[in-house]
Interface confidence: medium
């Protein structure tokens, strides 16, 4: 390391603690430091040291004890499985490295759950599930044995138990005692056996906790039965006069810092949203904590449900907040959520026993005061007359999610705090903030989500396109003329929304390249539905060269695209993803949504653009108030339109006007951004309102966007809102729930 | 009927590469592992690896780390080893040998055989 | 890696008398969960791929006559032929799959004496 021997604050020397094949990084201010080693190796025998108060950092010990001069970083290997009940695996092997596979097969007369193959990944853990193999014999299946773990008890009659262990020198995350319920399910959760150096992929912890998170919103229909091998999911029938609290607790402790603080409210911004996405409203409590609690949303608030609100409070959050008193007291943070659950007077009110509780808990460790925050949770288990009663243990009542971000998170202390539900995590370790902040961008854009329209990932690692994911580039080569750009819009699975002029009546469908996700290949076109009113040459005879309203066209695929990260609809107005995309409630009629999209004033929208390679947001406003008139009169100045005697006949009800400078000065569209969408973007999604159609002044000559551009110069795009009927018509096959 | 048809005979000169192909029928081949052994003149039998035909995943012994390549088209059903930088300690009767179930280490299934001789 | 040793190297029995060929390897091959013991044997005859006969150390392969018998556990495992038919002149391998990678004994030539 470039600064082996320089000395942290603590009083420490680095001498002598170099691991080789890695690197190291000191925490909290020079009292600890974490070993760091290459993607695929970890650090033998410990990742983290202390310096204790004599002055020298803690001794490197193995698992068994022994003292070793010299940390090194050593591979990764997964675990073998120690047992294997009623089947075999193969290969056999002391040890696996990473990519290696295993499978899993069955003696006859059991039969395989869970993952047949499984293969070795880069974090130490066995991809896919645990192999089972279970004759159905007894009242509740085969819990099976997870990877790593040794487990005593093979009856699985009613009220059986079996308990599970892991070697010396590993963690046990999940239950170490299960028993078999009525109904043939086991109480807790799946254990694993967890080193030190292992933490949760991003992609586990989003898969992972949405799974949970979505049986706690969405709740399962109490008819639905379940498959033959499958495992009974819980399943919670709304209650409509039932609600939900989501209680945010976040630590902002010393050893946190004020970047993964930042990082962390990111997190439960985007937590919001995605809850917000299933049309559900829990009332949210919101806790910051280091030595005492400050609770900023209490779940009792008139606002705490309004979505938009929480989410404000929660970026007026400042770090500095608990500068001065900086310890980690999980305790009374738990307290304060209890304190908010709990009611006056010990009367519960009506409905008490309908409410859902969900804890989230943010933290990078060790509460080191107040003493062991389990109690409180108990208190609340209590309070909630959760596991009381054997025949309603009201289990569905509580949930309690712990993050554990870091090197220093005390596997054990996070394991005890977080609930144990069957098929289900509750507990989760990831390396850094940055991947914590991976988990909720992964989160909102899993694949029940993919289809919501308007959606983005604005990840620091996101490319143009992550930003950008509805936006589809034309172009139109006509041999001998050179060919067109256009932009347009993924609208649905099969169309792409763009501008007619882009085309024309010749062009065959093998001439026309659509591009999206940034993707190099081309998809293939089945067919381009042009407005039936759309009719460039429409008033040469009145002397008007080109005639651009209706200006609009689909463009069909002939594959269905698939959705993903870099590819996926924009909302449409007057559909049901939009209603839900700005929160409305279902009942919202068109008009109301055009009410909340284009009031009669200056709208703040945008429009993307294509400059060097790379796309970029350009903020506009739509002039829908009183500048709507002087916005549309300068078309006058276009090229070919200044014999016109009334504006009326070329800027019709179906455009929209951007450009000039007031209220600010709007950039301008160039040539290739036609067809692409105009854009309003409204509670974290985006809506399309219209499609960039032409322009009074090309800006952009010789490639080039000029800086200075006259006052009139503005742009015009068709408003979705007057061809509604033909959009209905071209897309009812898509799904999109036209209003 | 369970087949396994090797290719025919070569002859390669040291530091060339070979590709045995091993043609799969009377089963699903992406259901079964596909195990390679092979065997000197007048030597015992080794075993070099394996190849998952679903997922293309594969498992070589130490040995040949770095040298064999076993690779798949399920298209054909078809596995194929290759082994490069010949010696002429690799003159040997290389067989595709296929387990009982999906992924049986007891090959109950084995091909014809392919001779290869180093030699220059 | 786990070694596989045979004894004897060659072996010479008369036609209807019993022939052993015994098998011990480096390390236990016994998965004391599944109490199975992780072994097999093959024959090959001169010009033709092995022929799988015994696995789990003592089940036999079905079509595999009855005179082939496999037995032993842990390091030490015998294969016999109660009754030597002239159709049994062979070399005879053990193979362990217990752990990565699978290795099999040397070989045992079986004649007829």
């Known amino acids: 390391t470039p600064w082996s021997l320089a000395r942290p604050q603590g009083s420490c020397s680095l001498e002598g603690v170099e691991i080789k094949g890695g690197s190291f990084r000191l925490l909290q201010e020079g009292q600890a430091l974490e070993y760091v080693c290459p993607s695929g190796f970890y650090p033998y025998p410990v990742q983290t040291r202390t310096c204790r108060s004599t002055g020298s950092w803690s001794t490197l010990k193995t698992q068994d004890q022994k003292t070793v001069r010299k940390a090194e970083c050593r591979a990764i290997h997964c675990p073998r499985p120690h047992d294997f009940e009623n089947g075999e695996y193969w290969p056999r092997s002391p040890y696996y490295n990473v990519s290696d596979e295993i499978s899993f097969h069955c003696y006859d007369g059991y039969t395989l759950r869970g993952s047949a193959n499984r293969t070795c990944q880069v974090n130490g853990r066995w991809s896919g599930q645990t192999a089972i193999c279970d004759n159905g014999a007894g009242y509740c299946s085969n819990p099976g044995i997870p990877i790593g773990t040794r487990k005593v008890g093979s009856q699985y009659r009613l009220e059986d138990s079996v308990t599970y262990h892991c070697s010396r020198g590993l963690t046990l995350r999940g239950s170490q005692r299960r028993t078999c319920q009525e109904g043939g399910s086991w109480s807790g959760t799946e254990p694993s056996c967890q080193d030190s150096f292992m933490y949760d992929t991003p992609q586990e912890v989003a898969e992972a906790f949405l799974s949970s998170l979505t049986e706690t919103i969405e709740g399962v229909d109490a008819e639905d039965g379940h498959g033959p091998g499958e495992q009974q999911k819980r399943k919670i029938v709304l209650d409509p006069s039932g609600s939900m609290n989501i209680y945010l607790v976040l630590d902002g402790s010393d050893s946190i810092g004020a970047s993964n603080f930042t990082g962390a409210k990111k997190c439960l911004v985007n937590l919001i949203e995605k809850v917000a996405s299933y049309g559900v409203k829990p009332r949210y409590g919101l806790v910051t904590y280091a030595t005492y609690p400050k609770i900023w949303v209490k779940v009792s608030e008139a606002d705490s449900s309004n979505a938009d609100w929480v989410t404000k409070q929660l970026n007026e959050i400042n770090y500095e907040d608990h500068k001065l008193k900086s310890g980690t007291n999980t305790k009374k943070a738990l307290q304060a959520v209890y304190s908010m659950m709990s009611w006056p007077d010990d009367v519960p009110p009506e409905g008490w026993n309908r409410t859902r509780h969900v804890i989230i808990l943010m933290t990078d460790g060790l509460h080191n005061m107040g003493g062991d925050p389990i109690t409180v949770i108990d208190e609340i288990r209590d309070l909630l007359y959760i596991g009381k009663d054997r025949k309603n243990p009201r289990e569905d009542y509580l949930d309690v999610y712990v993050f554990g971000v870091g090197p220093l998170v005390n596997q054990v202390n996070i394991n005890a705090l977080a609930s144990k539900k069957d098929n289900e995590q509750h507990v989760f370790k990831v390396k850094d903030m940055e991947n914590l902040e991976d988990v909720f961008y992964q989160m909102i854009d899993e694949s029940q989500s993919l289809s919501l329209c308007g959606m983005v990932w604005e990840h620091r690692k996101g490319t143009d396109y992550h930003k950008q994911p509805w936006q589809a580039k034309i172009s139109v080569i006509r041999p001998s003329k050179g060919h067109e750009s256009c932009m347009g819009a993924v609208v649905s699975e099969y169309f792409v929304l763009t501008a007619a002029h882009c085309f024309t009546v010749d062009d065959k469908e093998h001439s026309i390249k659509v591009s999206v996700g940034g993707e190099k290949r081309d998809l293939e076109i089945e067919v381009v539905l042009f407005h039936p009113n759309y009719n460039i040459n429409g008033k040469k005879e009145a002397g008007i060269p080109e005639f651009y309203d209706y200006d609009v066209a689909l463009i069909k695929l002939k594959n269905k695209l698939k959705y993903g990260q870099t590819i996926r609809p924009i909302c449409l107005p007057c559909t049901e993803g939009t209603t839900r995309a700005l929160r409305l409630p279902p009942t919202t009629t068109c008009q109301q949504q055009k009410e909340e999209l284009l009031p009669a004033q200056d709208i703040k929208a945008l429009f993307v653009s294509e400059e060097e390679k790379k796309l970029t947001r350009k903020e506009v406003y739509i002039k829908n108030g009183d500048k709507k008139g002087s916005c549309e009169r300068d078309a006058q100045y276009a090229p070919g339109y200044d014999k016109v005697k009334d504006i009326s006949e070329v800027v019709t009800p179906r455009f929209l006007c951007t450009g000039g400078v007031s209220p600010y000065a709007d950039p301008n569209t160039c040539r290739g951004d036609s067809g692409g969408p105009l854009i309003v973007h409204k509670r974290s999604r985006f809506i399309q309102v219209g499609v960039i159609s032409w322009g009074v002044v090309d800006v952009c000559k010789n490639q080039k966007r000029q800086k200075q551009v006259p006052a009139h110069a503005r742009d015009f795009h068709i408003n979705l809102f007057q061809v509604l009927p033909w959009l209905k018509e071209k897309l009812q096959d898509e799904d999109l729930g036209f209003l | 009927e369970v087949q396994l048809v090797q290719s025919g005979a070569e002859v390669k000169k040291p530091g060339a590469s070979v590709k045995v192909s091993c043609k799969a029928s009377g089963y699903s081949f992406t259901d079964y592992y596909m195990t390679w052994v092979r065997q000197a003149p007048g030597q015992g039998l080794e075993w070099m690896g394996w190849i998952n035909p679903n997922s293309g995943g594969t498992k070589y012994a130490q040995k040949f780390q770095g040298r064999v390549t076993m690779t798949r088209d399920t298209s054909i059903s078809t596995a194929y080893m290759e082994l490069s930088r010949l010696r002429s300690d690799d003159t040997a009767v290389y067989y595709c040998a296929r387990g009982y179930y999906a992924n049986s280490a007891w090959f109950a299934y084995w091909g014809q055989g392919t001779l290869v001789t180093v030699s220059s | 890696d786990i070694v596989m040793t045979q004894s004897p190297d060659s072996l010479a029995v008369s036609l209807g008398e019993r022939a052993t060929i015994n098998c011990k390897s480096s390390q236990s091959l016994l998965q004391s969960s599944t109490s199975k013991n992780y072994l097999a044997w093959y024959q090959q005859k001169p010009g033709q791929p092995p022929k799988l006969l015994i696995y789990?150390?003592?089940t036999r392969e079905s079509g595999v006559p009855d005179r082939f018998s496999g037995s032993g556990s842990g390091t030490d495992f015998t294969l016999t032929i109660s009754s030597l038919q002239a159709e049994d002149v062979a070399v005879y391998y053990c193979?362990?799959?217990?752990?990565?990678?699978?290795?099999f004994g040397q070989g045992t030539k079986l004649e007829i004496k």
């Open positions: 789990w150390a003592s």
């Open positions: 193979k362990q799959v217990y752990n990565l990678p699978w290795t």
